[in-house]
């Protein structure tokens, strides 16, 4: 009776279990009743990092110097290239696909410390009573407007991203 499931590092095809190709190799042909799975090593600048049945290897990541990137760790047939940014620059994400001089603080956060040559921008959440409605690399959280000092009342509460909205007091006739 043909199998419905295969062991680890195997895959089911044509009602039989074939061996997966090991990391660093791609599939050339599936196994048959009489032959083993045929695999081939990935070419230069290619990789596969898992046991697989892929017919094409993945291209190594390119660390584009025009984006401020350089190679942190050269790729192998089993691993992708790891990029990092030029000295003094910061990756925009874990994948490090582009570089920025320093990060900015999103709305709801203020700048606690402006970036220097050796440290990135330090952001802090705006506490109650303060807000920031912009992305910035220098602006702190701003205090909510004080409606009382303008002889007005709060019509809409403030948040960490928005100022309070003041309005006229209801006058009793």
């Amino acid at each position: 009776e043909p199998p419905t499931a295969c062991r680890e590092k195997q895959y089911l095809i044509n009602s039989q279990c074939c061996s997966l190709c090991q990391p660093g190799q791609k599939l050339v042909s599936d196994c048959t009743e009489f032959t083993e799975t045929e695999c081939l090593p990935c070419g230069e600048s290619e990789f596969l990092d898992t046991w697989n049945r892929e017919t094409h290897c993945h291209q190594h990541k390119y660390c584009d110097p025009n984006l401020g990137l350089r190679v942190q760790q050269k790729g192998t047939s089993e691993t992708d290239t790891i990029c990092t940014c030029e000295e003094g620059w910061h990756c925009t994400s874990e994948a490090c696909e582009s570089c920025v001089l320093h990060r900015s603080c999103s709305p709801g956060f203020g700048v606690k410390q402006i970036a220097t040559g050796v440290s990135d921008t330090i952001c802090e959440p705006c506490p109650v009573g303060f807000f920031s409605n912009v992305s910035s690399a220098f602006e702190k959280c701003h205090p909510w407007t004080s409606c009382e000092t303008k002889d007005l009342v709060v019509q809409q509460a403030g948040t960490n991203k928005t100022d309070v909205v003041c309005g006229p007091q209801d006058r009793l006739r």
Partner: nanobody
């Protein structure tokens, strides 16, 4: 494509003044915080000054406070840096930059040399 073109640099004597300009294109200038950053020979990048999109709030590094003034004209898509009482230590290439400071969105800079 974002383009930032700095101009106005040159050779000036200590105590002199210069006004740098940065012509911006390829993005909505009025929506972005803008910065002036400089790089002295053999040194790292130094954040000099910044201005918010509306031009109502500014930042200055301690080294230039009271001597430099940042401003912007959103109708002309241009950023300015008025530099007074220049010192030898202000010698550097000056760059303008927009948030979020992508490496590939920088201009070529303009060289300011302060020397007698």
């Amino acid at each position: 494509e974002v383009q930032l073109l700095e101009s106005g640099g040159g050779l000036v004597q200590p105590g002199g003044s210069l006004r740098l300009s940065c012509a911006a294109s390829g993005f909505t200038f009025r929506d972005y915080e803008m910065w002036w950053v400089r790089q002295a020979p053999g040194k790292g990048l130094e954040r000099v000054s910044a201005i918010n999109p509306q031009g109502t709030r500014t930042y200055y590094a301690d080294s230039v406070k009271g001597r430099f003034t940042i401003s912007r004209d959103n109708s002309k898509n241009t950023l300015y840096l008025q530099m007074n009482s220049l010192r030898a230590e202000d010698t550097a290439v000056y760059y303008c930059a927009k948030l979020p400071f992508f490496f590939h969105e920088w201009g070529q800079g303009t060289l300011v040399t302060v020397s007698s």
